[in-house]
């Protein structure tokens, strides 16, 4: 959401979020670090083109023109130079002076130490513990956004895990209509569309630095959860990672895992669409997950096959018209799950990214909440670990990635809603090795051909 | 280069706080954790925790929560360690030392300082 | 919690002989594990990191091995400016666990 700094009268007001790096004679004097060079205040740069018409309500939602309801100045930062304020690296870069190239490596959760796992476990309890140190989240829409008497901002803290949480829900919630009507569903500025992968690929590297900066340690990476094993069992629900099924309810996790006392958050849906508030920072209860225990739908009992990874990585176009969750030989599509393995769009299937999902059958398998399962992470890791193997493969084609008519927030040069500071689709769809700082140790399955006799 | 510099030795009683300064140079202070490790006389290495120099967030290690407390000032890049109601046990040498690489490991130590504790 | 053991706990040795100091975990730390030597008033110097990566400017008849739960520092021919104490370290969820250390003294 927004930088601490900006959630002020005086920021909203003037719809300049461009806080000082190091002011050295008052506040204002290093805007975006720009007495040193790294950066100046500048206009936002917003998306106008004309999204598709499954989104009849121009005007009426925050998250449209991302960020321009809220701001319309932010820093523009030089060079290597990027965060907020201009005082952090880009991704890939480290340094004072944003110069020393990183690579940071995401592992299979299976294949690290003891040490290692138990690590990444404490780190993720350490970040659901951790007040974000940056953001603060709006718990109101814009135009209730100063309060009832006008002067006061309506901004939570809220943990760094939570944050993450946070961001998901706000981009997928349902369009708020007024008091009275029916808030308007059909508008999802993270799912089934071209900006799927994009915008989990920045939700992601968005934690990883979070995490890094809380721990200092800049070689901490998120690893990732092989979720393609044909199996139904969850191979990494074990209380040494995240956590076993409890013996006491089968839907809980074990209390000897840490992720037993986690509570959810973002989980009141009938208040934010009925009043018109917004998800806070307030924890509710347990996380739900009961790994293949669907019987009503025995086809998300069992996990997406090692091959289907294999065949979806076949599928050269990354997006199809209508750009959408009935896109045929879309890359996008086939591996967000709406499509079958081979890209062929099918109402009745569901398979990979939300195949895994659904098989967690709980709070992972639904969609306003599911981060609040670490689960999440691992999941997501993956997925993205395929897009950058398809990026490789293909050259980063972003030519089917449309500039225009897309299902609103999935536009080629729209801002991620709600990413501060604003980053388009565009900055995502690029391998991360080169461009990102981090790369995956991982082995792609081979597709088997089976030889006439 | 690197340099930590901590504050001087200490003798104190029983029951009274002590304050111990680590100022640090040659690198940006706000980058890096500051770690404080404990060593009683005669003995080994014994890990008290860390502080985020970013966020001022402290971690402490077993046996260090409560009389122990991690603070910063990043105006004057420098790390503080203070321990209060101090026992006969606390009689110690006490170091700080960044985790200046990436690879969690101690490659710059202050020079330490002795907090002796008698009545 | 991890624990690190060392052995021997005291070593004697002459100057120009071939010096071997192990650590054993508790559990494995994969190779996260470094040495440190310390000399009367002094605070410790890092010699190893990663189980076998020299730190900057230490010579090179250090070398470490070893990783999951045994390690060894050797240092292949002792200088009389190598007789100190040694101690080994893992880190675990940002907090540091040492051995008790090795004295390596003049026979």
């Known amino acids: 959401q927004f930088p601490r700094q900006c959630a002020t009268v005086e920021a909203l007001r003037s719809g300049m979020c461009c806080p000082d790096l190091s002011p050295v004679s008052g506040p204002g004097t290093d805007r975006c670090g720009s007495s040193s060079g790294r950066g100046r205040c500048e206009a936002v740069t917003a998306d106008s083109r004309p999204h598709s018409p499954q989104y009849p309500h121009d005007g009426r939602d925050d998250r449209e023109v991302w960020p321009l309801r809220f701001f319309n100045r932010t820093c523009h930062c030089n060079g290597n130079f990027s965060g907020h304020n201009c005082g952090t690296c880009r991704p890939g870069w480290r340094g004072a002076a944003c110069d020393q190239r990183v690579l940071i490596v995401r592992r299979n959760l299976l294949d690290l130490s003891k040490e290692e796992k138990n690590h990444f476990v404490r780190a993720l309890d350490m970040a659901k513990r951790t007040t974000h140190p940056l953001f603060v989240i709006a718990t109101r829409r814009s135009e209730e956004i100063l309060g009832p008497d006008g002067n006061t901002p309506q901004f939570e803290n809220i943990s760094i895990y939570n944050y993450f949480v946070w961001t998901h829900y706000y981009s997928v919630k349902k369009t708020f209509l007024g008091v009275g009507q029916e808030s308007f569903g059909e508008v999802d500025f993270s799912h089934e569309g071209p900006a799927f992968l994009t915008w989990h690929r920045y939700h992601l590297l968005r934690l990883e630095k979070d995490m890094q900066e809380m721990l200092q340690e800049p070689s901490f990476s998120l690893p990732y959860w092989n979720f393609a094993t044909g199996k139904n069992v969850c191979d990494i629900c074990t209380d040494d990672l995240m956590g076993s099924r409890s013996n006491f309810d089968s839907t809980l996790i074990s209390p000897n895992s840490v992720f037993s006392q986690w509570r959810v958050v973002c989980d009141s849906l009938e208040d934010y669409d009925t009043l018109g508030t917004l998800c806070n920072s307030t924890e509710d209860g347990p996380i739900r997950r009961n790994p293949a225990g669907n019987v009503a739908r025995p086809m998300v009992q069992r996990l997406p096959e090692p091959q289907d990874v294999a065949q979806c990585l076949e599928v050269g176009l990354f997006d199809t018209p209508p750009f959408y969750s009935n896109s045929t030989n879309s890359f996008r599509n086939t591996v967000e799950g709406y499509s079958d393995p081979t890209g062929k769009y099918d109402p009745a299937v569901r398979s990979l990214h939300n195949l895994a999902h659904l098989f967690l059958n709980g709070t992972g398998g639904q969609t306003h909440l599911s981060p609040n399962d670490p689960i999440f992470v691992l999941l997501h890791t993956f997925t993205d670990a395929v897009f950058d193997e398809w990026l490789r493969r293909y050259n980063a084609d972003i030519s089917t990635f449309p500039l225009e008519n897309a299902p609103i927030g999935h536009n080629r040069q729209y801002n991620m809603v709600p990413f501060w500071p604003p980053v388009t689709n565009t900055e995502m769809f690029v391998t991360a090795p080169d461009n990102l700082g981090y790369t995956y140790e991982i082995q792609w399955p081979s597709r088997e051909f089976s030889v006439p006799e | 280069q690197v340099q930590l510099v901590q504050s001087g030795s200490e003798l104190k009683k029983p029951g009274a706080s002590v304050k111990i300064s680590c100022k640090a140079s040659g690198y940006t202070f706000t980058s890096y954790a500051m770690n404080w490790v404990r060593q009683a006389p005669g003995q080994g290495l014994e890990s008290m925790g860390w502080i985020n120099t970013n966020t001022g967030n402290p971690t402490y290690a077993q046996g260090f929560t409560g009389r122990f407390v991690f603070s910063m000032d990043t105006s004057v890049s420098t790390a503080y360690l203070q321990i209060s109601s101090l026992k006969a046990e606390d009689t110690a040498i006490y170091y700080c030392a960044p985790r200046y690489s990436s690879s969690w490991y101690l490659d710059y130590w202050g020079q330490g300082t002795l907090v002796t504790v008698s009545s | 919690e991890i624990v690190l053991t060392q052995s021997p706990a005291t070593l004697s040795l002459s100057p120009g002989e071939r010096a071997t100091l192990s650590c054993r975990a508790s559990?494995?730390?994969?190779?996260?594990l470094a040495w440190y030597q310390q000399k009367p008033g002094q605070a410790p110097r890092l010699l190893i990191y990663?189980?076998?990566n020299r730190a900057t400017g230490i010579p090179a008849r250090f070398s470490g091995s070893g990783s999951g739960t045994d390690f060894t520092i050797t240092i292949s021919s002792l200088e009389p400016e190598d007789f100190a104490v040694y101690y080994c370290q893992q880190r675990s969820n940002w907090l540091y666990t040492f051995g008790q250390g090795t004295k390596l003294e003049i026979k």
């Open positions: 990663d189980a076998s």
């Open positions: 559990q494995s730390v994969s190779s996260y």
